[in-house]
């Protein structure tokens, strides 16, 4: 509550608003007949700073000199203390401490565009905590002066609202800013400049790009600029890049040829302008122009691989696979792939365009020497064809890589290692490591992956299209001229025990032994590469440990004979599967009683 000072007065000298570090005099005096029982000697006047007693005096008035007040407001209260009564508030005072303005620093002025107005900015320095009036003065030739004021605690910008013209671009102008508040004043150092120093051109506009004859090598960038612009700088980058290419040009007159753009690439272009070689400042960058460069015919060659599959005595199936060209090699949208199949001795050739796929399957006779060529085509032309002779990739046993192993290498990676073939290792021209998901049916629709490795390498890390808990059939081919040798292994990047055991679907009796047939475990339940199956059996109603037979896992196998069962005894049989991580739960149980005679 604001006290009305009915009992007395508080006066403050020199003011309620003082400079940081200065002294303030506070006087508290009682009005007539407002003391203790009218006995002045009993009056005890006490001065509080906030809630802390800082001075007292017996009598009608109290005078106190106060120093060291902090920035901001400090509250003083004068109270009267009489014997046997509570202190009575007489009057209060708030003293506000601020600072005089510091010298404004780094005064700089700018005119945005030839038609813009002069505006200046500066650094105010330390906060004064007080209303401070800033006056900006500009003086020019012929004793012309302009002045603008801003009355705000936080003023650091003023626009004169006048336009400097290029009639006499070398004429000097001087700007100065003065800050004044109730505690003092300070002026900046003068800033002297010419028209050319302070005019920052507007950014270029209406940016366009033209490709003569739809060719990336004949590209011109066009733009519009203010009339006095002398210099431009251009920057451009592919839209997916963070790094800019930079070009400086003089007297470009709104056009520049660009020679190093890549085809079929979206670029971002920006331009900035300047009026003078070494005076003034660059404009802001223009708005971005985004444009796609035209296509060029593909470069590079496709990476092609193939698989052969025997159909019957006279026919074989050839499946060709190839990898997409990289963006920089495709140099455009690949419209189709051209596959040419040729019988080398008879000269018979067949050409087909493939769209939307990177594979092709056909059936050819088992006789004759066959070759294929595959190329990629965009709107401007085709890549050089990749030619390969179709051969039996695993025919040369002496070229087969040795000691092939496949080990998990972190998440979704498999490290394949091998030893060179026994035959002269220097004959190997390259290794190809091929992998595909293992499907018990040998499904040819399963995607094929491959990578090429130099002849001196004996390992490869495969990571493309590798999933956890999936078993891959991995082959390593050693190629030499028109011969090849191969070795294969199963591998997985991560494994655990299978989720289920095989399902026994039939038990048949054959000459005193039995043949157990089962259904493969679904691929998604195998949880990696299977190493073994186990067949368990025990007499029905017996508490004895079951007997077992462990069979190495082979992809195509789904039956196995057992000849150690006694005739006319009922047995319970079941199966499990094992990966390197452990054994599955039981599959289904089947009962069987052998009818034949005991051996």
């Amino acid at each position: 509550k604001i006290d009305a000072c009915k009992r007395g007065d508080v006066t403050v000298k020199p003011s309620h608003v003082i400079l940081l570090g200065s002294t303030v005099n506070i006087t508290c005096s009682l009005k007539p007949r407002q003391g203790c029982f009218h006995y002045s000697r009993r009056n005890k006047l006490i001065l509080y700073k906030f809630d802390r007693r800082i001075n007292f005096h017996h009598g009608h008035s109290l005078n106190s000199q106060v120093t060291g007040l902090p920035l901001g407001t400090t509250l003083f209260v004068c109270k009267l203390a009489c014997i046997n009564s509570d202190e009575i508030q007489i009057c209060g005072a708030e003293i506000f401490v601020g600072v005089a303005p510091e010298q404004p620093q780094n005064l700089s002025c700018i005119q945005k565009g030839e038609q813009g107005t002069v505006a200046c900015t500066w650094e105010r320095g330390r906060d004064t905590h007080l209303y401070t009036e800033y006056t900006l003065q500009l003086s020019g030739p012929k004793n012309l002066t302009w002045q603008k004021q801003c009355k705000d605690i936080y003023c650091d910008y003023l626009d004169f609202g006048i336009n400097l013209t290029p009639e006499s671009p070398e004429s000097n102008f001087t700007a100065k800013v003065t800050a004044v508040n109730s505690l003092g004043s300070s002026s900046s150092l003068p800033s002297t400049f010419t028209f050319l120093d302070i005019v920052r051109p507007l950014p270029p506009w209406d940016i366009r790009i033209k490709f003569q004859k739809a060719s990336v090598s004949r590209c011109t960038l066009y733009w519009r600029d203010e009339g006095l612009v002398l210099l431009n700088r251009l920057r451009y980058r592919p839209s997916n890049s963070r790094l800019w290419n930079m070009v400086n040009v003089t007297k470009a007159k709104g056009r520049h040829d660009l020679l190093d753009l890549k085809p079929f690439t979206e670029y971002e272009f920006q331009i900035s302008s300047k009026l003078h070689l070494y005076k003034g400042s660059w404009s802001d960058w223009s708005e971005s122009l985004r444009a796609q460069t035209p296509e060029e015919e593909p470069t590079g060659m496709l990476d092609v691989w193939y698989m052969k599959r025997h159909i019957d005595y006279s026919r074989q199936q050839i499946s060709l696979f190839w990898k997409n060209l990289s963006v920089s090699e495709a140099r455009g949208k690949i419209l189709h792939y051209q596959v040419t199949l040729q019988e080398l001795t008879g000269g018979k050739a067949m050409t087909q365009n493939i769209t939307g796929h990177t594979s092709w399957t056909t059936v050819i006779p088992r006789t004759g020497n066959w070759a294929v060529a595959v190329s990629a085509a965009n709107s401007k032309g085709s890549s050089l064809p990749t030619r390969i002779n179709i051969m039996n990739l695993c025919e040369a046993g002496l070229l087969a890589p040795r000691q092939v192993s496949a080990n998990s290498e972190g998440m979704d990676n498999i490290l394949v290692t091998w030893q060179p073939p026994r035959k002269d290792p220097s004959a190997v021209q390259e290794y190809v490591v091929e992998w595909r998901e293992l499907h018990p049916g040998g499904d040819t629709q399963v995607p094929l992956n491959w990578l090429r490795s130099r002849p001196y390498n004996v390992s490869a890390l495969i990571s493309e299209n590798i999933k956890s808990y999936i078993c891959y059939e991995i082959r390593v081919y050693a190629l030499s001229g028109d011969q090849g040798g191969c070795s294969s292994i199963l591998g997985n990047s991560k494994h655990k025990a299978p989720l289920s055991g095989p399902h026994i679907n039939a038990i048949t009796e054959e000459k005193g032994s039995i043949l157990i047939s089962w259904n493969s475990i679904p691929v998604q339940e195998q949880m990696g590469c299977l190493l073994h199956y186990r067949i368990y059996w025990k007499e029905r109603d017996s508490n004895s440990q079951p007997q077992l037979c462990e069979i190495p896992y082979r992809v195509s196998q789904n039956s196995h004979p057992i000849n150690s069962l006694q005739p006319r005894v009922t047995y319970v049989l079941w199966m499990t599967a094992l990966t390197a991580a452990g054994e599955s739960s039981h599959g289904n149980e089947r009962e069987f009683c052998l009818q034949g005679k005991a051996n």
Epitope: I2, D3, A4, C5, D9, V10, T11, V12, H16, V17, I26, G72, T73, L75, F76, C91, G92, A93, E94, F96, G98, D127, T128, H129, L130, Y131, I153, S182
Partner: nanobody, 119 residues
Framework: QVQLQESGGGLVQAGGSLRLTCTAS????????MSWYRQAPGKQRELVAE???????TYADSVEGRFTISRDNAKNIVDLQMNSLKPEDTAVYYC?????????????WGRGTQVTVSS
């Protein structure tokens, strides 16, 4: 910001009295200090008297004992009672209000009222 309107100025003979009134309108909350300043022709503007919202006062040495400043916080009015006027008191008298603005003070000024003391 606050708007200030001064009244009560005029022509008076030496030894006479005048009462100046300043009324604050607009966002007049948190006015910390209300002051009277004066500016004689060709001179700097100087503090005459000020009164804080708690009632404490400050007077220029040249007017102490002759001038009294008072303030009605409820009505946002500040009065300057000027007695025993002298010719050297002739000036334009300006009202000023200092308001809290965050941890700073923001000032507002009136347009002034002319006081002329003839001898």
């Amino acid at each position: 910001q606050v708007q200030l309107q001064e009244s009560g100025g005029g022509l008076v003979q030496a030894g006479g009295s005048l009462r100046l009134t300043c009324t604050a309108s607009g966002s007049a909350a948190l006015i910390f200090l209300m002051s009277w300043y004066r500016q004689a022709p060709g001179k700097q503007r100087e503090l005459v008297a000020e009164v804080s919202r708690r009632g404490s006062t400050t007077y220029a040495d040249s007017v102490e004992g002759r001038f009294t400043i008072s303030r009605d916080n409820a009505k946002n009015i500040v009065d300057l009672q000027m007695n025993s006027l002298k010719p050297e008191d002739t000036a334009v008298y300006y009202c000023k209000a200092d308001q809290y603005y965050g941890d700073s003070l923001r000032s507002s000024w009136g347009r002034g009222t002319q006081v002329t003391v003839s001898s």
